[in-house]
C-alpha cells in the first residue's frame, strides 16, 4: 500500500506559497512525517495517541500544516521553496507495528522571481 | 534520567576530525540516534534486538561510529564540522516502551583553518 502513495499531486500553489502534500495509508494511527528540502529537515510532525485515544501532535519546527486521516500538508512560503530544491516526504510508522520508515513522494520545485513558473516533478520509487 | 544526559562532554578532537558523543540511558535497549548538523540529518543509527538478544545495527548514512551501552559516538572529519555549525543528538527510544523521542545534547562547534581553536557549547534543556 505504501508504494501507491506516490501517485498523488505533491505540490499545489496558493497565494504567496506552496502546499506540499505527504500522503500515508489510512491504516496508520501513529506516525512521524518529515519534509526534507534536499538533506535538510524543513518540517517535522508527529502524531501519537494516548490510552484514551486522545491525539497528541508535536510540530517542533512550527510549520503551518493540515492533517487528515491519510495526509499531512505543509504550507511553505516561496522563500523556503526557491532555488530549485528537491523535496521529500519521509514517513515513520509507529502504529500499527512493525516500526517502519519509508521515503514517500519526492519532487523538484523551481520558482523564479516569485512567479510560479515551472514545476518539474520526479517521483521516487 | 533523560534530562541528566546533557552533562557530558559532547565534542572531543582527534587527528583530522571530531568525535561527537550522544549519550542515552543504560536502560534503553533498542533505539535510533540521529545526529543533526543545523537542520540536516548527518548520521542515523538504529539498534534493534533479536529473540536471542542478538543486535542488529542499521547505519544508512554510513557514518563511522562507536556504540556502547549508553552512548553513540559519531566520527566526523573537519569538512563536516566546519563553519560554526550547531550539532544536535536526537534519540528515539523503542525499548523499553512506551515509544519516546528526545532531543538530547546540542552544541556549537567552530573550527578555523583546520585548527581546533575554539569550542562554545550550549546544552539544550
Amino acid at each position: 500500500e505504501l508504494n501507491d502513495l506516490a501517485n498523488h499531486r505533491m505540490f499545489s500553489f496558493h497565494d504567496g506559497g506552496v502546499q506540499i502534500s505527504c500522503n500515508y495509508p489510512e491504516t496508520v494511527q501513529q506516525l512521524k512525517m518529515q519534509l526534507f528540502k534536499d538533506r535538510e529537515v524543513l518540517c517535522d510532525l508527529t502524531k501519537t495517541k494516548g490510552s484514551g485515544n486522545t491525539v497528541s501532535i508535536k510540530n517542533p519546527m512550527s510549520c503551518p500544516y493540515q492533517l487528515s486521516n491519510n495526509s499531512v500538508s505543509f504550507f511553505l512560503d516561496n522563500a523556503d521553496s526557491s532555488q530549485g530544491s528537491y523535496f521529500l516526504c519521509s514517513l515513520s510508522i509507529f502504529d500499527p507495528p512493525p516500526f517502519q520508515e519509508k521515503n514517500l513522494s519526492g519532487g523538484y520545485l523551481l520558482i523564479y522571481e516569485s512567479q510560479l513558473c515551472c514545476q518539474l516533478k520526479l517521483w521516487l520509487p | 534520567e533523560l534530562n541528566d544526559l546533557a552533562n557530558h562532554r559532547m565534542f572531543s578532537f582527534h587527528d583530522g576530525g571530531v568525535q561527537i558523543s550522544c549519550n542515552y540511558p543504560e536502560t534503553v535497549q533498542q533505539l535510533k540516534m540521529q545526529l543533526f548538523k543545523d537542520r540536516e540529518v548527518l548520521c542515523d543509527l538504529t539498534k534493534t534486538k533479536g529473540s536471542g538478544n542478538t543486535v542488529s545495527i542499521k547505519n544508512p548514512m554510513s557514518c563511522p561510529y562507536q556504540l556502547s551501552n549508553n552512548s553513540v559516538s559519531f566520527f566526523l572529519d573537519n569538512a563536516d564540522s566546519s563553519q560554526g555549525s550547531y550539532f544536535l543528538c536526537s534519540l528515539s527510544i523503542f525499548d523499553p516502551p512506551p515509544f519516546q523521542e528526545k532531543n538530547l545534547s546540542g552544541g556549537y562547534l567552530l573550527i578555523y583553518e583546520s585548527q581546533l581553536c575554539c569550542q562554545l557549547k550550549l546544552w539544550l534543556p
Epitope: F99 | G50, P96
Partner: antibody
C-alpha cells in the same frame, strides 16, 4: 484483515515426522519474528521456538523439549512459516499455534487458530 | 531457561469483584512480562505487555504491575465475559508461559 492459517496437522505414529505450515496475510510478514506455541489437550501454553527476521540472519531458537527434533524455517517470498517435526513423541500431541510478534516500538502479536497434531500408535 | 509460576491455579469470584493473579519468574526479567487471556477453543489474546501497558482495544479494568521477578495482574471489576484462563509470559529471553489461572464466576 490479518490472518495466520496453520495446516499440516493430523495423526502420526511415535517416531514419525510431520511438517506444519502457517500462511500469513494482511501484514508485513518479513518484519515479524515468527513463533510456534503449542497446547496439549486440557493443558497450558508452551513455547516451542522462534525464527527471527532477515535483519537477524533468520536465527532460530528452540525450547529444550524440542531442540534437535524440530526445525523452524520461513519463506518470506511466500509469507509462510514452517515447522518440521521429527522423532515425534506422544507428549508432542497438542494444538500448534503460529504467532507473529514484534516489540518495536510496541509489543504486538497475531495468533493463528491452531492445528491439532496427534502422536499415537 | 527461565521458569514462570502462577497462583492461584484457579479461582471463583462474583461479578464486580476485584480479581488478582500473581506471577513469579525464576530470574530477573526486568519488565518484559505480558499477560494473555484464552477462552475455550480460541487462540490466546494479548492483554498487557511490558508489565503494565494495555494492548490496543483492551478494557481499562485490566491492569498489571511489578518488576524483576514478581508480577501482579488485576481485573478491577470482574465481568461475565472475563471468564477465561489467564497466562503470564516472559519475553526477556525467548518466551516462557506460566501454567495459567482459570477464572470463573461463583
Amino acid at each position: 484483515e490479518v490472518q495466520l492459517v496453520e495446516s499440516g496437522g493430523g495423526l502420526v505414529k511415535p517416531g514419525g515426522s510431520l511438517r506444519l505450515s502457517c500462511a500469513a496475510s494482511g501484514f508485513t510478514f518479513s518484519d515479524y519474528f515468527m513463533h510456534w506455541v503449542r497446547q496439549a489437550p486440557g493443558k497450558g501454553l508452551e513455547w516451542v521456538g522462534v525464527i527471527d527476521t532477515k535483519s537477524f540472519n533468520y536465527a532460530t531458537y528452540y525450547s529444550d523439549l524440542v531442540k534437535g527434533r524440530f526445525t523452524i524455517s520461513r519463506d518470506d517470498s511466500k509469507n509462510t512459516l514452517y515447522l518440521q517435526m521429527n522423532s515425534l513423541k506422544t507428549e508432542d500431541t497438542a494444538v500448534y499455534y503460529c504467532t507473529a510478534t514484534i516489540a518495536v516500538p510496541y509489543y504486538f502479536d497475531y495468533w493463528g487458530q491452531g492445528t491439532l497434531v496427534t502422536v499415537s500408535s | 531457561d527461565i521458569q514462570m509460576t502462577q497462583s492461584p491455579s484457579s479461582l471463583s469470584a462474583s461479578v464486580g469483584d476485584r480479581v488478582t493473579i500473581t506471577c513469579q519468574a525464576s530470574q530477573d526479567i526486568s519488565n518484559y512480562l505480558s499477560w494473555y487471556q484464552q477462552k475455550p477453543g480460541k487462540a490466546p489474546k494479548l492483554l498487557i505487555y511490558y508489565t503494565n501497558l494495555l494492548a490496543e482495544g483492551v478494557p481499562s479494568r485490566f491492569s498489571g504491575s511489578g518488576s524483576g521477578t514478581d508480577f501482579t495482574f488485576t481485573i478491577s471489576s470482574l465481568q461475565p465475559e472475563d471468564i477465561a484462563t489467564y497466562y503470564c509470559q516472559q519475553y526477556y529471553n525467548y518466551r516462557t508461559f506460566g501454567p495459567g489461572t482459570k477464572v470463573d464466576i461463583k
